[in-house]
């Protein structure tokens, strides 16, 4: 049950898709990675306080729980709730592939 | 992937499993649940430090990024791999019924 | 959709162990909160609690045929397993198996009769 | 053990009428009693647990009440359907423990 999208901490505050511009080096891709030279990195970014997009009854849980044992328990956080795909070339030993990769680029988020 | 399962803050203090007692009270469920009384939620709890257990491309990614960029990017974040059924009695307007929960308990953790 | 079906040999001798079988679908015993008990009836009589066992594997029995009764079950295959040793004309009964989610039976399977007679 | 105490074996009632089955236990089991329904050659069904609540599916004509030692299972406007064995269940302490029984005739 994705709960709601209202955001009480003020605008952009909350779990929402971030993208976030990244070299080969700044990934560590450099030695294995030949194309793209630059990833628009899609992740998720931002607080979840209650009930704000809840993935799931687990997440309803955290948040209780939470609330009432905050040093124990820490609140839900912000994860993709799905990906897009991405393709890189990379480097072999022979030369050059093509690898679609399936869990690269969040494509949407909530609070887990 | 799951990588590495050694955790270098030492033991118990990266992301796991951990089982907290909760009343129905305490999980704002009293008005809706008969049965259990109290649930031993098992959740994950702990830190993602690199390469921990990083659940995909994507954990690993924010690992780099997290490192460049920590207040830009956060670290990865310790949620369930998967989850354990459970079964819950509930009111309902009639009566009650059994309902069986498959997001309910954490089953095993990584970091994302 | 909730069945259970039990089964088992239907005649047996004093001082011979029964074993019965409680197969079921519907539901799984890997689901935190949910059991499976055994409960007997003598023709014409009521209800008698022997057994009942958990998700998590723990076990309850009735202390009254306790060092008599092993329960027993198979997750995976979805059955749940009962063993009466040293059985005697008392325990000709009907025995029904019975999903038991926090004490409540709220499936019971046909039941299977059981004579003991020599 | 507790024992669940069904005073009345036989309760003979007519179609349309309100009848009160009751059941008394040994000692306090707060609200943790069911109650079940069997019909002449059938399996038990469940009809109420948590003592007064009825389970998915049951008639609202079906009615649980007390708690502590006293209950009471009453079936208002009585169907022909309901000829059965009534039978209460403590589930407050292992082992659990059935009343036993009460034949319900209709007239």
């Known amino acids: 049950a994705r709960n709601g999208d209202h955001c009480p901490l003020g605008p952009g505050r909350c779990c929402r898709l971030h993208t976030v511009r990244a070299s080969l080096e700044d990934l560590g891709w450099a030695d294995w990675v030949l194309s793209p030279r630059e990833v628009q990195v899609t992740m998720c970014i931002g607080a979840c306080p209650s009930q704000f997009r809840a993935a799931n009854m687990h997440a309803q849980i955290k948040t209780s729980l939470h609330r009432l044992k905050p040093d124990t328990v820490p609140a839900p956080c912000c994860v993709p709730a799905s990906y897009n795909p991405m393709v890189l070339i990379q480097k072999t030993d022979t030369g050059v592939s093509l690898q679609t990769y399936d869990d690269l680029l969040a494509k949407d988020c909530h609070c887990i | 992937a799951r990588n590495g399962d050694h955790c270098p803050l030492g033991p118990g203090r990266c992301c796991r499993l951990h089982t907290v007692r909760a009343s129905l009270e305490d999980l704002g469920w009293a008005d809706w649940v008969l049965s259990p009384r109290e649930v031993q939620v098992t959740m994950c709890i702990g830190a993602c430090p690199s390469q921990f257990r990083a659940a995909n491309m994507h954990a690993q990614i924010k690992t780099s990024l997290h490192r460049l960029k920590p207040d830009t990017v956060p670290a990865p974040c310790c949620v369930p791999a998967s989850y354990n059924p459970m079964v819950l009695i509930q009111k309902t307007d009639t009566g009650v019924s059994l309902q069986t929960y498959d997001d309910l308990l954490a089953k095993d953790c990584h970091c994302i | 959709q909730v069945t259970l079906k039990e089964s088992g040999p239907g005649i047996l001798k004093p001082s011979q162990t029964l074993s019965l079988t409680c197969s079921f679908s519907?539901?799984?015993?890997?689901?935190?909160?949910?059991?499976v008990g055994w409960i007997r009836q003598p023709s014409g009589k009521g209800l008698e609690w022997l057994a009942h066992?958990?998700?998590?594997?723990?076990?309850y029995y009735n202390p009254s045929l306790k060092s008599h009764l092993t329960i027993s079950k198979d997750t995976s295959r979805n059955q749940v397993f009962l063993m009466i040793t040293s059985v005697d004309t008392a325990d000709t009964a009907t025995y029904y198996c019975?999903?038991?989610?926090?004490?409540?039976?709220?499936?019971w399977g046909q039941g299977t009769t059981l004579t003991v007679s020599s | 053990d507790i024992v669940m105490t069904q005073a009345q074996n036989f309760m003979s009632t007519s179609v349309g009428d309100r009848v009160s089955v009751t059941c008394k236990a040994s000692q306090n089991v707060d609200t943790n009693v069911a109650w079940y329904q069997q019909k002449p050659g059938q399996s038990p069904k469940a009809l109420i647990y948590s003592a007064s609540y009825r389970y998915s599916g049951v008639p609202d004509r079906f009615t649980g009440s007390g708690s502590g030692t006293d209950f009471t299972l009453t079936i208002s406007n009585v169907q022909s359907d309901d000829l059965a064995d009534y039978f209460c269940q403590q589930y407050n302490t292992y082992p659990y423990t059935f009343g036993g029984g009460t034949k319900l005739e209709i007239k």
């Open positions: 519907g539901f799984s015993l890997s689901t935190s909160g949910m059991g």
């Open positions: 066992i958990w998700w998590n594997d723990d076990k």
């Open positions: 019975a999903r038991g989610a926090y004490d409540f039976f709220d499936y």
